[in-house]
């Protein structure tokens, strides 16, 4: 039985050229995390963090994606094309798979504030 919940940074905005932290947190379960996947809006894989073998950033994103903090992901040098949904997938045992969603809006405005708070989707 899956008792856990994924808390995410929810809907966030950041300015073009800046950076943003995508963060998910699995709570309310004792399940062991074997792997966390980060996917983009078109379901292309950005990175995985395997519990034993660590971080693997997909080569196409290596210059703009940094691992962490924690199981999160930092996107750098943001472009307007980065606007969209991002998904964290937690592979765990014995529970199975948990999935969280974040929506990132990249703003042209230099006054765009980075707004982030943890939400339960």
């Amino acid at each position: 039985m899956m008792t856990g919940t994924i808390e995410t940074t929810g809907n966030i905005s950041a300015k073009k050229g800046g950076s943003v932290i995508l963060q998910c947190h699995l709570s309310s379960t004792m399940a062991q995390v074997t792997q966390v996947n980060w996917e983009q809006h078109d379901h292309s894989l950005l990175a995985i963090r395997n519990a034993e073998l660590g971080w693997h950033i997909y080569p196409a994103f290596k210059d703009r994606v940094a691992p962490g903090p924690g199981l999160g992901l930092t996107l750098q040098s943001l472009t307007m094309n980065d606007t969209g949904e991002y998904f964290c997938t937690y592979h765990t045992y014995p529970d199975g798979t948990y999935r969280g969603r974040i929506f990132l809006e990249v703003l042209e405005s230099s006054v765009a504030e980075h707004s982030a708070r943890f939400q339960i989707p």
Epitope: L45, L53, T89, G96
Partner: antibody
Framework: QVQLVQSGAEVKKPGASVKVSCKAS????????IGWVRQAPGQGLEWMGW????????NYAQKLQGRVTMTTDTSTSTAYMELRSLRSDDTAVYYC??????????????????WGQGTMVTVSS | DIQMTQSPSSLSASVGDRVTITCRAS??????LNWYQQKPGKAPKLLIY???SLQSGVPSRFSGSGSGTDFTLTISSLQPEDFATYYC????????FGGGTKVEIK
Amino acid sequence: QVQLVQSGAEVKKPGASVKVSCKASGYTFTSYPIGWVRQAPGQGLEWMGWISSYNGNTNYAQKLQGRVTMTTDTSTSTAYMELRSLRSDDTAVYYCARDLKSFWSGDVLGAFDIWGQGTMVTVSS
Amino acid sequence: DIQMTQSPSSLSASVGDRVTITCRASQSISSYLNWYQQKPGKAPKLLIYAASSLQSGVPSRFSGSGSGTDFTLTISSLQPEDFATYYCQQSVPPRTFGGGTKVEIK
């Protein structure tokens, strides 16, 4: 075709070290982890550990910690397993194996579909 | 570490028989369970991964089922080339194998 080719049989004295190589071909070496499994004569399979050919990170079986080192050379698509302070009970066939899933599949890793032919290591005085 | 107990350790069967091998984990491993076939002097061959997914190129007479702690490998109609030793392996860290089941000709 996808294959792993291992180095030849070795005979070692107790206390010595052995280094087994595993050359990969037919796929993108850095996209898959490589595991090592051994099998003593007439016995079952024993997990030794594995290595990410992408970032070099390793994870070893507890009982071999401190005696085993796994490395890769991405320029030659070769994985290596070195075992030190050999004992008679290290006599076994040593296999390298490639994970079924690439890092970029997004699937959980840990099943091995491509195996080397095995390297017999005999430890005897 | 999670212990994997296979049963039986050996069995005798005839061509055409339905053969069932079981594997029990000492704690729940969800569906992180793989099955291999090994013939003497050869490397293991992956048959089933993630408890029930048939590996490419493996005949459909092989099937896997189960989740949690109890898993089964079934050969629906044993063929001459199926006489071998079968191992389960759990892929929860740290990985471990079952002790093996030798399938012999009756």
